[in-house]
């Protein structure tokens, strides 16, 4: 079956820094700001363009090893990312892959927030276990949490 | 805040030399693809030069190919213009413009979103 | 290289009046990511060029919503819905698909 799942979490960062910092360079910059998160980025096919595979590698005592990641889509024009979770982490005997949406749009004080669609191709009559998605969002808000200090911090970048 | 300032323009003979300069500020500049673009007196806009965020890839117009030389100093956060055997016609005025930024997902381009306050160049005897 | 041709190259217009100039481009600015890499910009009297639309109709930071622009492959418009006093100025067309990046040659915006 499918099971959607959606998020919202606001930031003080304008969409079009976020961006930039969380979506367009987040490969560089997240295992820079959270590597207790996130150890490395690699692309294994492609140039970052949709189709790409990346392989994320998770640090050590994580409950995974690594995730491999499809980008579906970037469009730069309306802030709006697609990628699927296609090997590694959850994603096995009980879950054949995870559909994921980040759209950044304009918050009225400035900011922005942040949507997250998750859709979860599960086989057979498996169902999501709401502790995992749970989990899952809370790890998406702390990435953002860092990269949000370190945009703060570092008055320069990503403008 | 984000700006880029021109500066090494002047009076100068056919046949003379400048440096032209533009030191970036309030973003990150080795992320960017940079453009020189010029403006006679009375006339519209021409394009003239770019080169990308490392510096390995540099294009040029027909018009000055062979007598600037565009480049650029990622930890000056500057980029230079190199114009020999100056002509009367390249007397305008020079802007340095930012063009599209790259990252880890790619080069994207967002238009020519900031532009210097110009420089100006006069080729006269 | 890619001819840009602006019409019309004078344009005077009643404040509060719409305003529409047009672009046309020898070949097409259609790129393989989607997107048309034609910009709009607008030069006032004395000051730098500053960019209006990128990509064909996106509006840039800070720009107005008065300003639009439309239009895909050869052919392109920028409209103002309402001209305001300090809409004067030139405008130019600029291709970005290929180098060298080349402008249309102006269209002056002047008020009636």
């Known amino acids: 079956g499918v099971f959607n799942y959606e998020a919202e979490t606001p930031s003080v960062i304008p969409a079009a820094r976020l961006f930039k910092a969380f979506i367009l360079d987040g490969d560089k910059l997240l295992p820079k700001v959270a590597p207790e998160a996130v150890s490395s980025v690699e692309n294994i096919e492609g140039n970052g363009g949709p189709g790409t595979i990346k392989k994320i590698t998770f640090p050590e005592g994580s409950p995974f090893k690594y995730v491999k990641e499809r980008v579906d889509e970037v469009d730069r024009v309306n802030f709006k990312y697609s990628f699927s979770v296609i090997e590694g982490g959850a994603v096995g005997d009980a879950l054949e892959k995870v559909c994921n949406e980040i759209k950044i749009v304009a918050a009225p004080d400035g900011g922005s927030i942040l949507k997250i669609s998750n859709k979860f191709h599960t086989k057979g009559d498996h169902e999501i276990n709401a502790e995992q998605i749970k989990i899952e969002k809370e790890k998406a808000v702390g990435l953002l949490k860092a990269v949000e200090s370190y945009l703060l911090a570092h008055s320069d970048a990503y403008n | 805040q984000v700006q880029l300032v021109e500066s090494g323009g002047g009076l100068v003979k056919p046949g003379g030399s400048l440096r032209l300069s533009c030191a970036a500020s309030g973003f990150t500049f080795s992320d960017y693809y940079m453009n020189w673009i010029r403006q006679a007196p009375g006339k519209g806009l021409e394009w003239i030069s770019l080169?990308?965020?490392?510096?390995?890839?540099?294009y040029y117009s027909d018009s000055v190919k062979g007598r600037f030389t565009i480049s650029r100093d990622n930890a000056r956060k500057s980029l230079y213009l190199q114009v020999n055997s100056l002509r009367a016609e390249d007397t305008a005025v020079y802007y340095c413009?930012?063009?599209?930024?790259?990252?880890?997902?790619?080069?994207?381009?967002?238009?020519?979103?900031?532009w210097g306050q110009g420089t100006t160049v006069t080729v006269s005897s | 290289d890619i001819v840009m041709t602006q019409s019309p190259l004078s344009l005077p217009v009643t404040p509060g009046e719409p305003a529409s100039i047009s672009c046309r481009s020898s070949?097409?600015?259609?790129?393989?990511?989607?997107?048309?890499?034609l910009d709009w910009y607008l030069q006032k009297s004395g000051q730098s060029p500053q960019l209006l639309i990128y990509?064909?109709?996106n509006r840039a930071s800070g720009v107005p919503d008065r300003f639009s622009g439309s239009g895909s492959g050869t052919d392109f418009t920028l409209k103002i819905s309402r001209m305001e006093a300090e809409d004067v100025g030139v405008y130019y067309c600029?291709?970005?698909?290929?180098?060298?990046?080349?402008f249309g040659q102006g269209t002056k915006l002047e008020i009636k």
């Open positions: 080169i990308s965020s490392s510096g390995s890839a540099i």
């Open positions: 413009a930012r063009d599209r930024g790259e990252w880890a997902l790619g080069a994207y381009y967002y238009g020519l979103d900031v």
């Open positions: 990509l064909g109709s």
């Open positions: 600029m291709q970005a698909l290929q180098t060298p990046y080349t």
């Open positions: 070949q097409s600015l259609l790129h393989s990511d989607g997107y048309n890499y």
